[in-house]
């Protein structure tokens, strides 16, 4: 499955179309900060091998996708900067699927690790309360813009499993 | 709306296998894991696993391991959950919830599936 | 596995009466991760409170959820006849996610 190439650039479009979103200076929203704990260190401490890797990258673009594709989102944003960075994360989504089939086979599942998954998840929880508290604030959005921005980065270490063969 | 619809009541002998689907509508099939609780009669809530529709990997809670497979179908937003080697003790109402964030975790339930394991 | 052990088993109460409800986890939930699900007979469960304390959707603010770490509460302030049904908290704290064995809440 030669993912690596592609994933790289549509993570660098996505990752450009994100910063292009941003309509307020960050600086206006120090008061709204916050640590959101991106499992940065699980991910860091582990040797993800390639099927793990693609199913966490996938469940945070994911993740991602949900996030920007609600109601809330849509009158946050730019409406065609919104739409080319969730066609972006669509494309990586489809990507992943057809590895994770490829990898896999279509018919097994191997058991994963669940707690990267898991992490993941309540990594987005802590996201997704957050913005509810904020009330979906401008500030709030340009906060997790920034997040999102910084997990894309943080994920470094799952990249490097896509390269690994199994 | 999101609904979630359920095959039918079923009965069965211990030994064999039954699978239970689930019918999403109303969102985005491929977006959202689904997930499998069960009830026995008069009992409380168990998990047994979910399944991610957009490329079909699956968790199970350990319990369950090498007895049940959940599976999808992408063409008719349908998840699967197959039960084998029943016994008495798998009488039990079975239930799809969707998962989610915040308030959408398990907000969405099927109506239940009726599975009676009897000689 | 994180064990979720409600009590009591069964509480009976008047309408207009306040109701409290625990769940005591074995190992520490987080408490964004801890929620409490309404089931009435031959129904399938209800989501009644998110993340300790946040009230779902359509859910009366007689309502109410507090806790953290291993002890969470569900409060309804004065029951109304409606209210008489199994309550259940969860946690997706952590594989395998449990549910807790339900407190019965009845009319005296």
């Known amino acids: 499955c030669d993912l690596p190439q592609t994933h790289s650039l549509r993570n660098r479009r996505a990752l450009i179309l994100l910063a292009q979103m941003g309509r307020i200076s960050p600086f206006s929203c120090l008061k709204d900060r916050h640590e959101f704990r991106f499992p940065e260190e699980e991910f860091d401490g582990h040797q993800f091998q390639k099927t793990q890797a693609i199913s966490v990258l996938h469940e945070m673009i994911q993740q991602t996708f949900n996030l920007f594709s609600t109601e809330d989102s849509s009158a946050a944003w730019e409406q065609s900067l919104l739409e080319k960075f969730s066609t972006e994360l669509y494309q990586q989504l489809n990507d992943l699927e057809a590895c994770v089939i490829q990898e896999v086979g279509v018919e097994e599942t191997p058991l994963m690790n669940e707690d990267f998954i898991l992490a993941v998840r309540k990594y987005f929880q802590r996201i997704t309360l957050y913005l509810m508290e904020k009330k979906y604030s401008p500030c709030a959005w340009e906060v997790v813009r920034a997040e999102i921005m910084r997990s894309f980065s943080f994920s470094t270490n799952l990249k490097k499993g896509l390269r690994r063969k199994d | 709306q999101v609904q979630l619809v359920q095959s039918g009541a079923e009965v069965k002998k211990p030994g064999a296998s039954v699978k239970v689907s689930c019918k999403a509508s109303?969102?985005?099939?491929?977006?959202?894991?689904m997930h499998w609780v069960r009830q026995a009669p008069g009992q409380g809530l168990e998990w047994m696993g979910e399944i991610n529709p957009s490329h079909g990997r699956t968790i199970y809670a350990q319990k369950f391991q090498g007895r049940v497979t959940m599976t999808r179908d992408t063409s008719t937003s349908t998840v699967y959950m197959e039960l084998s080697s029943l016994r008495s003790e798998d009488t039990a109402v079975y239930y799809c919830?969707?998962?989610?964030?915040?308030?959408?975790?398990?907000?969405?339930w099927g109506q239940g599936t009726l599975v009676t394991v009897s000689s | 596995e994180i064990v979720l052990t409600q009590s009591p088993a069964t509480l009976s109460l008047s309408p207009g009466e306040r109701a409290t409800l625990s769940c005591s986890a074995g190992?520490?939930?987080?408490?964004?991760?801890l929620y409490w699900y309404q089931q009435k007979p031959g129904q399938a469960p209800r989501l009644l409170i998110y993340s300790t304390s946040n009230l779902a959707s359509g859910i009366p603010a007689r309502f109410s959820g507090s806790g953290s770490g291993t002890d969470f509460t569900l409060t309804i302030s004065s029951l109304e006849p409606e209210d008489f049904a199994v309550y259940y908290c969860?946690?997706?704290?952590?594989?395998?996610?449990?549910f807790g064995q339900g407190t019965k809440l009845e009319i005296k």
């Open positions: 919830a969707r998962g989610g964030l915040g308030p959408a975790w398990f907000a969405y």
């Open positions: 969860h946690q997706w704290s952590s594989y395998p996610f449990t």
């Open positions: 190992s520490s939930v987080d408490s964004s991760e």
């Open positions: 109303g969102y985005t099939f491929r977006n959202y894991w």
